[in-house]
């Protein structure tokens, strides 16, 4: 594969990453799958600067990110270390609430209307953000 040097059409470039902002909603797993099919991943927020960038583009709308604890500990989908990394939870979150009508807890993280993070039921059809790194090798064959 070749190294991607510019963002695909309809993606927004920022700090050597490309971002795509959905305008419809999907459950977290479907959003995760959508990004993977685009050779990307759900957005991984690594800094306050990136948080502000994403927040600016999504507005005051609940939006999935690439952070979940479906298998126990909180994990970023691209392997970024959660414990030492950037966090922006709402006060008293994440609470992994088990009181709702589901068998499981709130295992997926999203941006809330004020940009801070909350964990919620992964089935809610929230909007989502895909991210891919410009320096990453593309799966597409090089143009001859």
């Amino acid at each position: 594969g070749s190294e991607r040097t510019c963002c695909p059409v309809n993606w927004v470039e920022h700090e050597r990453s490309c971002y795509w902002f959905s305008r419809s909603g999907k459950a977290w797993a479907d959003a995760d799958n959508y990004c993977r099919l685009e050779d990307a991943h759900l957005v991984v927020v690594t800094s306050w600067e990136e948080q502000k960038f994403v927040q600016h583009h999504i507005g005051p709308v609940n939006t999935w990110m690439g952070l979940h604890d479906q298998n126990g500990p909180w994990k970023w989908v691209d392997g970024t270390d959660y414990e030492t990394g950037f966090k922006n939870w709402r006060p008293e979150q994440p609470d992994d609430w088990y009181g709702h009508g589901l068998g499981g807890g709130e295992d997926c993280a999203h941006f809330t209307d004020d940009g801070r993070w909350n964990d919620d039921v992964c089935q809610r059809p929230y909007r989502w953000v895909c991210e891919t790194e410009l320096d990453k090798a593309s799966q597409e064959p090089p143009l001859l």
């Epitope: 709402r90 589901l102 089935q123």
Partner: antibody
Framework: QVQLVQSGAEVKKPGASVKVSCKAS????????INWVRQATGQGLEWMGW????????GYAQKFQGRVTMTWNTSIRTAYMELSSLRSEDTAVYYC??????????????????????WGQGTTVTVSS | DIQMTQSPSSLSASVGDRVTITCRAS??????LGWYQQKPGKAPKRLIY???SLQSGVPSRFSGSGSGTEFTLTISSLQPEDFATYYC?????????FGPGTKVEIK
């Protein structure tokens, strides 16, 4: 048993605000969403939005964005829907409905659906000058 | 937003008739659809969830089918208490949207 009891009928002037309440009983209030749905006389059902008293999350239909606010008071197990800048077209019956995700057994991967299983009796709001 | 359409908008039928109501979504919604019955002056009551699962306590003459964009509610043998308005509701994406309703009247 599980019940949602709504406040009484309201008559408002155009430009005013109305706040409808929905008191829950028979279940853990914070374990479920509350949805608000309205129905103008002789018309169909229109979903306005939802709120969750545990997460603090709300979601409003674009049509009502900026005019509707959904709040709650956990201590008295009551949800509220406030609609501002009222106009004659807002004359309708307003319903609250309990909502939650559940799943079908025997499906792999698990298939989830959203259930609005219990509804309030409705509150009539009339907007007239 | 996902638009829901229903047909017919109203129908006249006799007790014992088989009645079919169709609901179409403007885009694929998997099985994320419920059917509700509403009688005058009353709150809606859910009959079918996940497109084809019967709500407990609802008579077996009601059934639902379909997935993707086309869904059907069938009443196999219409009873006097079934005269009402029927609505479909999609919960695949926010905002949730109802169909415009189908009024089932006595012929």
């Amino acid at each position: 048993q599980v019940q949602l009891v709504q406040s009484g009928a309201e008559v408002k002037k155009p430009g005013a605000s109305v706040k409808v309440s929905c008191k829950a009983s028979g279940y853990t209030f914070t374990s479920y969403d509350i949805n608000w749905v309205r129905q103008a006389t002789g018309q169909g059902l229109e979903w306005m939005g939802w709120m969750n008293p545990n997460s603090g999350n709300t979601g409003y239909a674009q049509k009502f964005q900026g005019r509707v606010t959904m709040t709650w008071n956990t201590s008295i197990r009551t949800a509220y829907m406030e609609l501002s800048s009222l106009r004659s077209e807002d004359t309708a019956v307003y319903y609250c409905a309990r909502g939650f995700y559940d799943f079908l057994t025997g499906y792999s991967p698990t298939y989830y659906y959203y259930d609005m299983d219990v509804w309030g009796q409705g509150t009539t709001v009339t907007v007239s000058s | 937003d996902i638009q829901m359409t229903q047909s017919p908008s109203s129908l006249s039928a006799s007790v014992g008739d088989r009645v079919t109501i169709t609901c179409r979504a403007s885009q694929g919604i998997r099985n994320d659809l419920g059917w509700y019955q509403q009688k005058p002056g009353k709150a809606p009551k859910r009959l079918i969830y996940a497109a084809s699962s019967l709500q407990s306590g609802v008579p077996s003459r009601f059934s639902g089918s379909g997935s993707g964009t086309e869904f059907t509610l069938t009443i196999s043998s219409l009873q006097p208490e079934d005269f009402a308005t029927y609505y479909c509701l999609q919960h695949n994406d926010y905002p949730f949207t109802f169909g415009p309703g189908t009024k089932v009247e006595i012929k």
